[in-house]
């Protein structure tokens, strides 16, 4: 968690942030872990520390190693580690896996590719973008701020995208490149009448008096992004918030899951310290979307504790 991998290419700029975050007013000291030697803060050095940032301007293969940052508040010192690897530039076009940042997915509706780590650098627009080493040209490609937008995305747009920009430090310019894979999702979504997977209609749930109980209302609404879909619980036909029993609460927020490609939601009803009167209530799991509303009813019954005979 407080050790972070960072990588770059020789003769390019590399800026690394201390993985141990602190308030802006805290001081940060950097050390080369192998020798415990302090990293200078003077900007005339090729490698220097600047607060939370460690700057290699430019980087060399010999800079590879583990760097320690110690963040100091008035009363606490906390340590982080940056594992830095600088690679030689490849002569061919292929970008090896170890130089790739996380893969991003896009679709017809959303096709932004962010340039990784760019927020650490002092750069000015425009960014240059390359796909499989070819400069991107044509009206479908728009370099906007720190990301690339592709219009009318097609499956052929999948591939490795490299952003290239210039970092400026005290009037000197340094090149930076970063590459990530882009995959295209087929987003042929649809919406259907809600299907409640749990609870079953007219289900009887056994509960123990004095214990806590959870009821989960789970429903699926179609495939892909759903524009209006909700699941909720009612007590005797009344919204939980209006029912006024603090022991019975819906879980804040609905969990969205994609089961077999379907868009599903669930809502947990938590009953604390189950009481006799809870057995008399009608619990309704409601699922609704643009197609309509489906309701499954649950009732609680007393579970008799098992007798243990010696």
């Amino acid at each position: 968690k407080f050790s972070k991998q960072s990588w770059g290419l020789e003769n390019e700029a590399l800026i690394v942030r201390c993985p141990r975050q602190g308030k802006p007013s805290y001081t940060v000291d950097w050390y080369y872990s192998q020798t415990n030697k302090s990293i200078p803060t003077q900007e005339r050095n090729r490698v220097f520390a600047s607060g939370q940032l460690l700057k290699f301007l430019p980087a060399a293969v010999a800079d590879s190693g583990i760097y320690t940052c110690i963040v100091r508040s008035p009363t606490f010192n906390r340590t982080g580690y940056a594992n830095v690897t600088i690679y030689k530039k490849q002569s061919d076009c292929n970008v090896p896996d170890y130089l790739m940042y996380s893969t991003v997915s896009g679709s017809e509706k959303n096709s932004k590719i962010y340039c990784p780590t760019i927020d650490l650098y002092n750069w000015t627009a425009p960014l240059e973008w390359f796909k499989n080493c070819q400069a991107l040209q044509g009206s479908r490609y728009r370099a906007h701020k720190s990301f690339l937008v592709i219009d009318n995305v097609m499956t052929e747009d999948a591939g490795d995208y490299t952003c290239k920009f210039i970092h400026n430090e005290n009037g000197a310019n340094y090149s930076v490149t970063a590459t990530r894979s882009f995959t295209v999702k087929d987003e042929q979504g649809f919406s259907l009448f809600p299907v409640i997977g749990a609870p079953a209609q007219n289900e009887i749930k056994e509960v123990e008096i004095g214990k806590n109980a959870n009821l989960t209302c789970s429903a699926c609404f179609g495939k892909g992004t759903q524009f209006l879909a909700a699941v909720l619980w009612q007590l005797n036909g009344t919204k939980i918030t209006d029912f006024g029993e603090p022991r019975i609460q819906q879980e804040e927020g609905q969990n969205q899951s994609f089961s077999n490609g379907l868009a599903c939601l669930d809502m947990v009803l938590r009953i604390a310290d189950v009481k006799e009167e809870d057995l008399l209530l009608q619990y309704d799991c409601l699922a609704l979307n643009l197609h309509g509303l489906r309701r499954h009813t649950v009732r609680l019954s007393r579970k008799n504790p098992i007798d243990h005979h010696s």
Epitope: K1, T75, F76, R78, T79
Partner: antibody, heavy 123, light 106 residues
Framework: EVQLLESGGGLVQPGGSLRLSCAAS????????MIWVRQAPGKGLEWVST????????YYADSVKGRFTISRDNSKNTLYLQMNSLRAEDTAVYYC????????????????WGQGTLVTVSS | EIVLTQSPATLSLSPGERATLSCRAS??????LAWYQQKPGQAPRLLIY???NRATGIPARFSGSGSGTDFTLTISSLEPEDFAVYYC????????FGQGTKVEIK
């Protein structure tokens, strides 16, 4: 010198409400995350709630979610805990404490604590 | 919720002896673990943070170790004022405390 002073505790019936206050001094209150921790008689410590500094984001233990509300007034250097629908199991000494470090989304230790105020929920 | 289990529940030792207290997490908390000391009628006092760092003003006889799920607080030579209840706290995912270990005079 950092000081935290809780008040507002007392005897309350089940289902009742109570508002605790914690007056802070000796540090720049607004930049620190503040926490309520409770301790039932003869029992261990239980985290109750955290409120961020100037951002004001809030976090709650499951046992109090929906019943307790943490808030702060940075102009008065005061932390609050509004407790509704109180239960017998909420009986405890309530401490306010300071988180000396946290950045958004993270938590840390509690370096200064008040002496606590006792809340008793009983009929 | 991350559950912290402290052992033993009670430790009976004499002044000058070495005390070893254990805290085990139900899942990894990296080094996001602290130790506190609490005496009767008092608020807890921070001893150790980030698993092994002593808080300001804490004597060198207190030391912490461990990472991930298993942590230890060691008091190298017990002083009379060290007899108290000790709690571990994780802050990797919200905040939870262990149930405490009481260090009592034998």
């Amino acid at each position: 010198e950092v000081q935290l002073l809780e008040s507002g505790g007392g005897l309350v019936q089940p289902g009742g409400s109570l508002r605790l206050s914690c007056a802070a001094s000796g540090f720049t209150f607004s930049v620190y995350d503040m926490i309520w921790v409770r301790q039932a008689p003869g029992k261990g410590l239980e985290w109750v709630s955290t409120i961020r500094g100037e951002g004001g984001g809030t976090y709650y233990a499951d046992s109090v979610k929906g019943r307790f509300t943490i808030s702060r007034d940075n102009s008065k250097n005061t932390l609050y805990l509004q407790m509704n629908s109180l239960r017998a199991e909420d009986t405890a000494v309530y401490y306010c404490a300071r988180d000396p470090w946290s950045t958004e989304g993270s938590f840390f230790v509690l370096d200064y604590w008040g002496q606590g105020t006792l809340v008793t929920v009983s009929s | 919720e991350i559950v912290l289990t402290q052992s033993p529940a009670t430790l009976s030792l004499s002044p000058g002896e070495r005390a070893t207290l254990s805290c085990r997490a139900s899942q990894s908390v990296d080094d996001d673990l602290a130790w506190y000391q609490q005496k009767p009628g008092q608020a807890p006092r921070l001893l150790i943070y980030d698993a092994s760092n002593r808080a300001t003003g804490i004597p060198a006889r207190f030391s912490g170790s461990g990472s991930g799920t298993d942590f230890t607080l060691t008091i190298s030579s017990l002083e009379p004022e060290d007899f108290a209840v000790y709690y571990c706290q994780q802050y990797n995912d919200a905040i939870t405390f262990g149930q405490g270990t009481k260090v009592e005079i034998k």
